[in-house]
């Protein structure tokens, strides 16, 4: 019998992840809830101990006895200023036991106190069990990751947690190192490489600069913010919707813990949606005093709410570069880690900072660390197997295949039931003036809006030369071969620059039954979808345009290029539109479009004036493919009429 595999565990502050290398590839293992990451939460009740999703799901009902953030305590003294500061924000109690912090909870009617190592060991036990359920045999060997800045006592305490969980800890490795291994950056054979790892997780933000030379990793610098992450973005959304609820229903839900917790859960879900769609809906039944809260938010609004937080991520990048005594041009590779790096605005800020450099993001960012840990675990166990390719075999395309165009619209290139192999090409264009790239998001499904369909994958085509919106021609080709492997290619016809994605496996795809159900539902919803799609698209277009214009004229780079009078004119009109939007989220398509055109009438002449002589659009510079709605936030692609 083949020897038991070793696992890689990313023990995170808010979420943990486990992977295994077998049959020549890494498999990130889903838990019993089907989630590939598991909350680093442990809850104690009158009857049982809960770990992971079950613990997080009941936190609103049992906050004092639900423990999280153990990673902020592990290996630290009680008197550590970090511990003293963090304690103020936790609903559970932390006590002092010989200058060691312990978490005190009520469990099965008794008061119990646990060391951080014990809490972490419970999470590690859960991760071990997840792996065992998948592999079908006991697992003992593991590689566990820690932040690069962890000191020896924090590393030892993490190892102890592994031992308590019944694991043989093969090695404790740095999270950024694991991420670099995941991308094979240690195997490029190109001499010394400087790698910047940008890790924006649920609760922490870490920037690390590594030098890799002949398989040797050296940490050159670390920086970050131990209290910046996805939860902060959730908080901004929560505050936004608390205010919206006040406006709409004249009621303040902020003191109702259960309502806020339910809102927070919906906000976290909406935030995730906004990384792949330009709009997200929240539907919370009976949120407060029997009132159903149905609302939505656009990506542009979310970006505005979090703009200062997003921008602040660049400060640690600059600090790490200074500390490493490197110029940004000397960085060879940029690696994205942590779920929050899925946020398009975060990616754009980082990419712009590095002058358009490509980002390593093909591996799921909240799985990259566990991925690398799994590879390292296999190496330490002496695995030398070859990689094996997954293939998807079909004879017809069971669902329409297409991409998202402006406003979250599904534009199908290959229709359902097309026989394969088949190849379809269509021309698309940009939504915004001087848009530097387009995000190609590939979906399958029959619904009018991509949010109701299934995301298969995404990639970006960058480096589009500055041009008025509607002018660039992006040729997109969907090609399914005889094996059912889908290749999607996007080419900028002006430069010949191309990028592609290959979708080869059926993970995340839908079953026959689901497909049938979706097809039937789509028929039923088609008419109402269409009206809603157009309305949402118009609302998106307006909101995104307003925020984009607002941020455009507030850009420091425009100082001296735009008169104060023009700036005021644009900002006043943007304020008018944004406030109107807040009060009229359910307005009709015509009203949104009218407001957008009004705003464009004010902004376009002013903005275009800035680009005159710089190859920018002059009046009427939109051509026949002029503005047609959709969202201008991020690299949006638009269908050409």
């Amino acid at each position: 019998m083949a020897k038991a595999a070793a696992i890689g565990i990313d023990l995170g502050t808010t979420y943990s992840c486990v992977g295994v290398f077998q049959h020549g590839k890494v498999e990130i293992i889903a838990n019993d809830q089907g989630n590939r990451t598991t909350p680093s939460y442990v809850a104690f009740t009158d009857t049982e101990r809960l770990i992971g999703d079950a613990a997080k799901n009941q936190v609103a009902l049992n906050p004092q006895n639900t423990v999280f953030d153990a990673k902020r305590l592990i290996g630290r003294k009680f008197g550590d200023p970090v511990v003293q500061s963090d304690m103020k924000h936790w609903p559970f109690q932390v006590i002092n036991d010989g200058d060691k912090p312990k978490v005190q909870v009520s469990y099965k009617g008794e008061t119990k106190a646990f060391y951080p190592e014990e809490i972490s060991s419970m999470v590690l036990t859960k991760m071990k069990e997840i792996a065992e359920a998948y592999l079908g045999y006991p697992v003992t060997n593991a590689v566990i990751t820690v932040p690069a800045y962890f000191n020896d006592s924090q590393r030892q305490a993490t190892k102890d947690a592994g031992v308590i969980a019944g694991l043989n800890v093969l090695r404790i490795i740095n999270e950024p190192t694991a991420a670099a291994i995941a991308y094979g950056l240690d195997r490029t054979g190109k001499g010394e490489r400087n790698v910047l790892i940008f890790d924006l997780g649920g609760g922490t933000f870490d920037v690390s600069i590594l030098t890799i030379d002949d398989g040797i990793f050296e940490v050159k610098a670390t920086a970050g913010d131990t209290h910046l992450g996805g939860e902060d973005f959730d908080n901004r959304l929560v505050n936004h919707f608390v205010e919206e609820f006040k406006r709409k229903h004249k009621k303040d839900i902020s003191q109702n813990k259960r309502a806020v917790r339910r809102l927070r859960t919906a906000c976290e879900r909406a935030k995730r949606t906004l990384s792949s769609s330009t709009q997200a809906s929240l539907e919370i039944d009976s949120l407060f005093e029997g009132i159903d809260f149905y609302t939505s938010i656009t990506r542009a609004r979310f970006e505005e709410l979090c703009s200062d937080l997003f921008r602040s991520t660049l400060e640690p990048v600059e600090k790490a570069l200074r500390d490493a005594k490197l110029d940004k041009a000397q960085i060879h590779d940029l690696v994205l880690v942590g779920g929050s790096t899925r946020i398009p605005k975060v990616q754009k800020l980082l990419q712009d900072f590095f002058n358009g450099r490509d980002l390593n993001k093909s591996i799921n960012p909240d799985e990259a660390v566990a991925y690398g840990a799994a590879v390292q675990a296999a190496i330490l166990m002496g695995d030398k197997s070859e990689n094996v390719q997954d293939l998807l075999l079909l004879d017809v395309a069971p669902l329409s295949l297409g991409l998202e165009t402006a406003g979250g619209v599904m534009t199908a290139l290959i229709k359902r039931n097309s026989t394969i192999p088949t190849k379809q090409t269509q021309i698309f264009t940009t939504y915004s003036d001087n848009q530097p790239g387009v995000l190609i998001q590939v979906y399958e499904g029959e619904r009018a809006m991509t949010k109701d369909n299934n995301l298969l994958g995404r990639f970006e085509l960058s480096g589009i030369p500055p041009a008025p919106r509607g002018v660039p021609q992006i040729e997109v080709t969907f090609d399914i071969d005889a094996n059912g492997i889908l290749n999607v290619t996007a080419t900028d016809k002006s430069t010949g620059k191309a990028n592609k994605i290959t979708i080869t496996n059926d993970k995340g795809r839908l079953s026959k039954e689901e497909i049938e159900r979706m097809v039937q539902e789509a028929e039923k919803y088609k008419a109402e979808d269409e009206v809603q799609r157009e309305r949402v698209s118009a609302k998106n277009a307006l909101e995104s345009y307003a925020f984009n214009m607002k941020s455009a004229v507030e850009d420091e780079g425009l100082k001296g290029k735009i008169s104060e009078a023009d700036k005021k004119k644009v900002l006043d009109k943007c304020q008018e539109v944004i406030s109107w939007l807040d009060a009229n989220t359910l307005a009709e398509k015509d009203e949104f479009e009218h407001k957008r055109k009004e705003l464009e009438q004010v902004c376009n002449p002013i903005i275009s004036g800035l680009y005159q002589g710089a190859g920018g659009p002059g009046p009427g510079g939109f051509g026949a493919q002029g503005p047609k709605g959709g969202s201008g936030s991020g690299p949006t692609i638009e269908e050409v009429d």
Epitope: S579, W580, N584, D590, Q601, P619
Partner: antibody, heavy 116, light 112 residues
Framework: QIQLVQSGAEVKKPGASVKVSCKAS????????MNWVRQAPGQGLEWMGW????????TYADDFKGRFTFTTDTSTSTAYMDLRSLRSDDTAVYFC?????????WGQGTLVTVSS | EIVLTQSPDSLAVSLGERATINCKSS????????????LAWYQQKPGQSPKLLIY???TRESGVPDRFSGSGSGTDFTLTIDSLQAEDVAVYYC????????FGGGTKVEIK
């Protein structure tokens, strides 16, 4: 000074088409929207819609969707209102009006009479 | 669609007296962000094009005599002519620009 000068009165038969022009001067044409307003004999003002002179995108009020078309020619700073399939109840004075939060300058109006 | 209802339909006032015209909107015209009400008043003399008098409820267009004033908020608005002059004989229209645009039905002001 700012002026909007409209084309002269028209008499048309039912089913015919008419094109009313509105030539702007004294300001940058593409910086301001152009509205169209109808006033039937002895009646009040009816907002027909407007055109974004920068992008050329029109907006039509519900009652004016279908037979009406707004266009511009930025090279001559002129806005146009096209009306096809004329009916007797289209008899009215048609005004163009510059827009900047409010309709601050108006054309003199063009009387279109539809009669068999 | 927002409906504006003007009252009265017509009004006869003696020279030098005050004329008051009301305009009621089917929904609020107040933008809470800008704290402005998007309502304007226009004057149309016989055989002429309309002329802008007041915008944002109470801001007089330049060149408009100060006997014309506007007030109100939300859904109820008033145009007041403090001391009616002969040249003020006209039809007065309110117009909203909160969402799309609509005119009120007009109020005819005559001399008593």
């Amino acid at each position: 000074q700012i002026q909007l000068v409209q084309s002269g009165a028209e008499v048309k038969k039912p089913g015919a088409s008419v094109k009313v022009s509105c030539k702007a001067s004294g300001y940058t044409f593409t910086n301001y929207g152009m509205n169209w307003v109808r006033q039937a004999p002895g009646q009040g003002l009816e907002w027909m819609g407007w055109i974004n002179t920068y992008t050329g995108e029109p907006t039509y009020a519900d009652d004016f969707k279908g037979r009406f078309t707004f266009t511009t020619d930025t090279s001559t700073s002129t806005a146009y209102m096209d009306l096809r399939s004329l009916r007797s109840d289209d008899t009215a004075v048609y005004f163009c009006a510059r827009y900047d939060h409010y309709m601050d300058y108006w054309g003199q109006g063009t009387l279109v009479t539809v009669s068999s | 669609e927002i409906v504006l209802t003007q009252s009265p339909d017509s009004l006869a006032v003696s020279l030098g007296e005050r004329a008051t015209i009301n305009c009621k909107s089917s929904q609020s015209l107040l933008n809470s962000g800008t704290r402005k009400n998007y309502l304007a008043w226009y004057q149309q003399k016989p055989g002429q094009s309309p002329k802008l008098l007041i915008y944002w409820t109470s801001t007089r267009e330049s060149g408009v005599p100060d006997r014309f004033s506007g007030s109100g908020s939300g859904t109820d608005f008033t145009l007041t002519i403090d001391s009616l002059q002969a040249e003020d004989v006209a039809v007065y229209y309110c117009k909203q620009s909160y969402t799309l645009y609509t005119f009120g039905g007009g109020t005819k002001v005559e001399i008593k």
